[in-house]
């Protein structure tokens, strides 16, 4: 077994976790995750590795002269689901009630607040981690009287005697004291999208303003897609 550094056979390749150094023309050791090459190999000495410094990382076996910088702190509309360590970059995902409008390789670059459907409109398609809520007008016989990113259109209560007929944004009002319903009373909620990652991480101080991110998108309730029919 050859020990690094060594000259590869003509036309041969270096082994796993080794790289070919063009200057030394030798197979040399790579540095493991969490470390980087402090001194490159020569014909007589192998790579010298050093640990990644604060807020930098390497995830793979490498021979980079400097570790990669961890991404900036998560903005106020995000949660840190993976902390920056020597071996992994920080991952930011959107808070509940927000979705990822612009993703990056891992985590989210830009979060936007989930659209809220206004009265007369209900959720046709719930928001996910990466897609916004789709609203639809409540069909005849159904209503929604809330501004919500989770409420769907609910059936009007069925009255023996109608005092005020229902419309898209209001339930029917009965004169009798015992209305019946095709569904149980109370708002019907769709679940909020939740992050699939549950890794506990140490807190990272977040800046008071999101650095150059969510100001591009409305931070209040988004106007509903009123012309939308859902699909």
């Amino acid at each position: 077994v050859a020990f690094t550094p060594y000259a590869p056979e003509p036309g041969g390749t270096c082994r796993l976790r080794e790289y070919y150094d063009q200057t030394a023309q030798m197979c040399c050791s790579k540095c493991p995750p969490g470390q980087h090459a402090k001194v490159f190999c020569t014909k007589t000495s192998d790579t010298v590795c050093d640990s990644c410094e604060d807020s930098t990382y390497t995830q793979l076996w490498n021979w980079v002269p400097e570790c990669l910088s961890c991404g900036s702190r998560c903005s106020s509309d995000q949660v840190e689901t993976q902390a920056c360590t020597r071996e992994q970059n920080r991952i930011c995902t959107c808070r509940p009630g927000w979705y990822c409008a612009l993703s990056k390789q891992e985590g989210c670059r830009l979060c936007a607040q989930l659209r809220k459907c206004r009265p007369g409109f209900g959720v046709a398609r719930p928001g996910t981690e990466t897609s916004d809520v789709v609203c639809k007008p409540c069909a005849p016989g159904t209503f929604s009287n809330t501004t919500s990113s989770t409420d769907i259109c609910r059936p009007h209560q069925i009255c023996h005697v109608v005092a005020i007929p229902g419309n898209a944004s209001m339930d029917a009002v009965c004169t009798s004291t015992s209305p019946t319903r095709s569904m149980a009373p109370g708002a019907v909620h769709l679940p909020q999208p939740v992050s699939t990652r549950s890794q506990h991480t140490q807190p990272t101080p977040a800046p008071s303003t999101a650095p150059g991110t969510s100001f591009l998108l409305p931070v209040g309730p988004s106007p509903p897609a009123e012309g939308s029919t859902g699909d």
Partner: antibody, heavy 118, light 106 residues
Framework: QVQLVQSGAELKKPGASVKVSCKAS????????MNWVRQAPGQSLEWMGI????????SYAQKLQGRVTLTTDTSTSTAYMELRSLRSDDTAVYYC???????????WGTGTTVTVSS | DIQLTQSPSFLSASVGDRVTITCRAS?????MYWYQQKPGKAPKPWIY???NLASGVPSRFSGSGSGTEYTLTISSLQPEDAATYYC?????????FGSGTKLEIK
């Protein structure tokens, strides 16, 4: 509760070597890097080096390079620090400390007093 | 190596006092870390990532700073806070510690 229990006090003569052990319990040993930090009497803390048990790689403080060797035995979750050619200014309390892959020492060992005296 | 200079090196204050310890770095650092050490004991992590309190640290402690100047503040000194405090950086290899600030209760 993560614990790092170190070996007992040592009295050594100048020129000798010392090997201090640090046994870890209650965590996955290879998931955490092990650092060694020493503290001379009445002095501040001095980082000596780090070992990455997962990969067996090490990095040492320049001033101790060539005199210190860090090793681990993953089967017993034990880290070792050997310091050779001891001098009187090596008299100190030696601590092992994990860093959890971050940049501070979150769990410290019980400490081992090494006295170098003729 | 980055040198960390702590001031003051010794501090005597009364219970209830507001106390500030400063750590100056010879070069800019990303974050500062602080430890508390009592005689005959191993150091305990006290503040990490400049301003986050380690588990079990009372809320009267706080950390702040950036670049080359960082501070540890105790808003209302308590008897159990008597100890030596060390700052530490790892923005550059090797990691280095400050010279320590010994805090005594009057």
């Amino acid at each position: 509760q993560v614990q790092l229990v170190q070996s007992g006090a040592e009295l050594k003569k100048p020129g000798a070597s010392v090997k201090v052990s640090c046994k870890a319990s209650s965590y996955s040993f290879t998931d955490y890097n092990m650092n060694w930090v020493r503290q001379a009497p009445g002095q501040s803390l001095e980082w000596m080096g780090i070992i990455f048990p997962k990969y067996g790689t090490t990095s040492y403080a320049q001033k101790l390079q060539g005199r210190v060797t860090l090793t681990t035995d993953t089967s017993t979750s034990t880290a070792y620090m050997e310091l050779r050619s001891l001098r009187s200014d090596d008299t100190a309390v030696y601590y092992c400390a994990t860093d959890g892959g971050t940049w501070y020492f979150d769990v410290w060992g019980t400490g081992t007093t090494v006295t170098v005296s003729s | 190596d980055i040198q960390l200079t702590q001031s003051p090196s010794f501090l005597s204050a009364s219970v209830g006092d507001r106390v500030t310890i400063t750590c100056r770095a010879s070069s800019s650092v990303t974050y500062m870390y602080w430890y508390q050490q009592k005689p005959g004991k191993a150091p305990k992590p006290w503040i990490y990532l400049t301003s986050n309190l380690a588990s079990g640290v009372p809320s009267r402690f706080s950390g702040s700073g950036s670049g080359t100047e960082y501070t540890l503040t105790i808003s209302s000194l308590q008897p159990e806070d008597a100890a030596t405090y060390y700052c530490q950086q790892w923005s550059s290899n090797p990691p280095t510690f400050g010279s320590g600030t010994k805090l005594e209760i009057k």
